[in-house]
């Protein structure tokens, strides 16, 4: 079956703050109550589970991975945060109602090759871009 | 002061479904109960509010914008979803406990020029990359 995971949906505690532009690197373990920081997680996707078995010949599925976790102040150094994400983290820290925290999303994606039937039932080998998460970050 | 916004944190209703890889374009009005879809929102960031007035000379602030909204099945055609985001949306749709929905994040960012004091109190004009959201999408 398609994937499994444990997810924490907790909101960050956000004591008021006002501050600056690249705190992405401020914490190696940022969340005060040990919520997981933004990172890559395991996910195997079965094409049968998606209902694609009639047109995808191979592979049967693939390791897609996914991104999830906190992008809270102060951000971890490995979070590859953009300048905008750092600013947004600080704005959220000042006033959580103003903006959401940045979100944990793929920063690098890889392709996979898929053998499939096209509309005319020809067998096609095609490389589909941006199918596999290689790295995650705060955006 | 730095920005203001209204945010809906509602979870999507996710009836079971099975579907395919370019379903990103399936709906022009995706959310069944009119939750806002992923899009760019207004946000003005004041450098004083961030506590940066001691080193940033100009500007006093800037229009940063931010991304927020639903990345629920079926995705709107303008959401610039990656293939992985489409797959993740479907996996979430089949079993919401497996993975989160993709998140709404910047797809294009612009730079701004900043006049500031360096370590030696010299006045420097520098272009800071990835400071302004130009477009949002589902990732």
């Amino acid at each position: 079956s398609t994937g499994s995971k444990q997810r924490s949906q907790n909101r960050s505690k956000t004591p008021k703050n006002q501050e600056a532009l690249r705190m992405a690197n401020v914490a190696e373990n940022s969340s005060s109550d040990q919520r997981q920081a933004c990172k890559k997680h395991e996910l195997y996707v079965s094409f049968r589970d998606l209902g694609w078995q009639d047109w995808i010949i191979a592979p049967e599925g693939y390791a897609a991975y996914y991104c999830e976790g906190e992008c809270a102040f102060p951000l971890n150094s490995y979070m590859n945060a953009t300048n905008h994400a750092i600013v947004q983290t600080l704005v959220h820290f000042i006033n959580p109602e103003t903006v959401p925290k940045p979100c944990c999303a793929p920063t690098q994606l890889n392709a996979i090759s898929v053998l499939y039937f096209d509309d005319s039932s020809n067998v096609i080998l095609k490389k589909y871009r941006n199918m596999v998460v290689r790295a995650c970050g705060c955006h | 002061s730095t920005g203001s916004k209204q945010r809906s944190q509602n979870r999507s209703k996710t009836p079971k479904n099975q579907e395919a890889l370019r379903m990103a374009n399936v709906a022009e009005n995706s959310s069944s109960d009119q939750r806002q879809a992923c899009k760019k929102h207004e946000l003005y960031v004041s450098f004083r509010d961030l506590g940066w007035q001691d080193w940033i000379i100009a500007p006093e602030g800037y229009a940063a914008y931010y991304c927020e909204g639903e990345c629920a099945f079926p995705l709107n055609s303008y959401m610039n979803a990656t293939n992985h985001a489409i797959v993740q949306t479907l996996v979430h749709f089949i079993n919401p406990e497996t993975v989160p929905k993709p998140c709404c994040a910047p797809t294009q960012l612009n730079a701004i020029s900043v006049l500031y004091f360096d370590d030696s109190s010299n006045v420097i004009l520098k272009k800071y990359r990835n400071m302004v959201v130009r477009a949002c999408g589902c990732h």
């Epitope: 008021k16 600056a20 690249r22 | -």
Partner: nanobody
């Protein structure tokens, strides 16, 4: 090259207090946050407390109510007041200063040992 120099570590009995200091060797432009981290044997480095240049603070749950972070803007110094110390607070404590647009600055660490 900017250096951060920590001091104030040492050995103390459980329930005791220490005050750590972290001084920058020269002015750093664009500082927006400073933090104290700690690392004990076999564990990852973890955030203890952080402070912004506008003096807003954030604490790890395990030190809330016991530790206080503060800073002296004029002297580029950040402090960590540690009260009611526990044996599990034993670690090497590191100072970090984050400046916009460049790599973070780390101190070399100061050891804190709390005996029961």
């Amino acid at each position: 090259e900017v250096q951060l120099v920590e001091s104030g570590g040492g050995s103390v009995q459980a329930g005791g207090s220490l005050r750590l200091s972290c001084a920058a060797s020269r002015r750093i432009s664009g500082i927006y946050a400073m933090g104290w981290y700690r690392q004990s044997p076999g564990k990852e480095r973890e955030l203890v407390a952080a402070i912004t240049t506008s003096d807003h603070t954030n604490y790890a749950d395990f030190v809330k109510g016991r530790f206080t972070i503060s800073r002296d803007k004029v002297n580029n110094t950040v402090y960590l007041e540690m009260n009611t110390l526990k044996p599990e607070d034993t670690a090497v404590y590191y100072c970090k200063q984050s400046a916009w647009g460049r790599n973070d600055y780390w101190g070399q660490g100061t050891r804190v040992t709390v005996s029961s």
